[in-house]
Amino acid sequence: LTCLGGFASPGPVPPSTALRELIEELVNITQNQKAPLCNGSMVWSINLTAGMYCAALESLINVSGCSAIEKTQRMLSGFCPHKVSAGQFSSLHVRDTKIEVAQFVKDLLLHLKKLFREGQFN
């Protein structure tokens, strides 16, 4: 099953250094998590991989007052070609489906690791 690594879809993709830094930040968040991340806040889940950076930002930007993910929010905003503000709802999100921020960050880390492994950062 190890040969089944994810296959990224086209779209605006950050350069390798920026992607590596985002991965490192997500690793830090997941490893240093003691109390529930962002007090257990929930965010919209995503059901596609195209346009993932903007969709991820649209989900996370609705979490306010959570210093642990502020750097991630800033980094994602650099990867998304358009301005994202709270309350936006992309077609990439699963309506009525929310997951915990901690799980979303973990899932985002998984997906970005796949992109990096596949060389999808040019």
Partner: nanobody, 118 residues
Framework: GVQLLESGGGLVQPGGSLRLSCAAS????????MGWARQAPGKGLEWVSA????????YYADSVKGRFTISRDNSKNTLYLQMNSLRAEDTAVYYC???????????WGQGTLVTVSS
């Protein structure tokens, strides 16, 4: 939290068909490679089939090649296993699971029983 809920199992005659479904919730299903594993009575766990996150690549155990088809619908957070030409040796509990190389991302369902018998 994370949930994987299998359905579609049951009793079927040899040569018959079943379609298993796995409804995923609590995580970003679209970003995970997924698969089906099974455990026959008194035997170990066997990976049956797997599919990558975008549904473009699939894997099948030799024992089910040409008979089983794995698919997924990311818009519905659902994984499927179409099982045709079923044999007595396909009798097992079938589990839906994530199929990532890193076991940090390891999630399993409770399983659904498939019995192939005349």
């Amino acid at each position: 939290g994370v949930q994987l809920l299998e359905s579609g199992g049951g009793l079927v005659q040899p040569g018959g068909s079943l379609r298993l479904s796995c409804a995923a919730s609590g995580f970003t299903f679209a970003w995970y490679d997924m698969g089906w594993a099974r455990q026959a009575p008194g035997k170990g766990l066997e990976w049956v089939s797997a599919i990558d996150d975008l549904g473009r690549r699939t894997y099948y155990a030799d024992s089910v090649k040409g008979r089983f088809t794995i698919s997924r619908d990311n818009s519905k957070n659902t994984l499927y296993l179409q099982m045709n030409s079923l044999r007595a040796e396909d009798t097992a509990v079938y589990y839906c699971a994530t199929a990532e190389r890193d076991d940090t991302f390891d999630y399993w369902g409770q399983g659904t029983l498939v019995t192939v018998s005349s």
